[in-house]
């Protein structure tokens, strides 16, 4: 089931998924001056079986001027700054991304794709937060958020991260971080059973990730 809302916004921070659960969908978005080909897919879908997951469908962009003929154009640096929404993320491919059962890696970029990606997450997805360049992380607890199903409704847990305006970037996720105090987690998690399979796996995997998987263009 798709998560109703997007991961929480943390001031001066961006989020990133290390891997995408099966069922996740990614919009086929094109950069300015290009459009999705008429017969092309609207979304890519993370799909698979117990042993292998991959992205179904391919995104294809064509020049808005010349319809249905794909044009190979390398984006100029000034074209990289277009609209931003909180759910869009950089299409950067983590080089050391581990394989998780039932998860897809970051899809490779397609020709003339938009500068940021729009994902539709499913229940059980975990995302990780990092402060943008020029801000330092103060952890009260885990700098991650999980989409959970509670009483038939989905919600994202609140990441315990504050980004302060000190001129140094945070080292994530290798920083020391204290355990979150009970009052740090406002949501009640005792009244309903929530399955947390593979959350721990993802957390362990996150600890091995390099900070390079995040971009710092979100200011």
């Amino acid at each position: 089931e798709l998560c109703d809302d997007d991961p929480p916004e943390i001031p001066h921070a961006t989020f990133k998924a290390m891997a995408y659960k099966e069922g996740t969908m990614l919009n086929c978005e094109c950069k300015r001056g290009f459009r999705r080909i008429k017969s092309g897919s609207l979304y890519m879908l993370c799909t698979g079986n117990s042993s292998h997951s991959s992205w179904d469908n391919q995104c294809q962009c064509t020049s808005s001027a010349t319809r249905n003929t794909t044009k190979q154009v390398t984006p100029q640096p000034e074209e990289q700054k277009e609209r931003k929404t909180t759910e869009m993320q950089s299409p950067m491919q983590p080089v050391d991304q581990a394989s998780l059962p039932g998860h897809c890696r970051e899809p490779p970029p397609w020709e003339n794709e938009a500068t940021e990606r729009i994902y539709h997450f499913v229940v059980g997805q975990m995302v990780y937060y990092q402060c943008v360049q020029g801000y330092r992380a103060l952890h009260r607890g885990p700098a991650e958020s999980v989409c959970k199903m509670t009483h038939g409704k989905t919600r994202w847990t609140q990441p315990q991260l504050i980004c302060t305006g000190e001129m140094e970037t945070s080292q994530f996720p290798g920083e020391e971080k204290p355990q979150a105090s009970p009052e740090g987690r406002p949501e009640s998690e005792t009244s309903c059973l929530v399955t947390t399979t593979d959350f721990q796996i993802q957390t362990e995997m996150a600890a091995t990730m390099e900070t390079s998987i995040f971009t710092t263009e979100y200011q």
Epitope: N27, C30, T85, T86, I118
Partner: nanobody, 126 residues
């Protein structure tokens, strides 16, 4: 020229229902994602619901899920928002929006929508 025209707003008591309509001209809804947003006085515009023309993805804000239903009549080039169990906090101007790509939902998701209606007022009294 593209036009989206909302209708169906009005004053209703808490617990009541309304059905909003969005009539499109200048574009065909059968190749556009349609969405509803709302803006309460003094607040930012808020995503309510969206549905692509292929019915692959339908998204709702958690605050309306289970109470509101987005639907569309592609042949009639019209979109709908059925609003049940209305609450005073649903009071706002409701806007219809459309875009060529897939569904975009979320806190600041308005930017990617290309076309907007003028809005229709919904007031829920307690």
């Amino acid at each position: 020229q593209v036009q989206l025209v909302e209708s169906g707003g009005g004053l209703v008591q808490a617990g009541g229902s309304l059905r909003l309509s969005c009539a499109a001209s200048g574009i065909t809804f059968n190749d556009h994602t349609m969405a509803w947003f709302r803006q309460a006085p003094g607040k930012e515009r808020e995503f309510v619901a969206a549905r692509d023309w292929s019915d692959i993805i339908t998204r709702y804000a958690s605050s309306v899920k289970g109470r509101f239903t987005i639907s569309r009549d592609n042949a009639g080039n019209t979109g709908f928002l059925q609003m049940n169990s209305l609450r005073p906090e649903d009071t706002a101007v409701y806007y219809c929006a459309a875009r060529e790509g897939g569904v975009v939902a979320g806190v600041r998701s308005g930017a990617p929508y290309d076309y907007w209606g003028q809005g229709t007022q919904v007031t829920v009294s307690s």
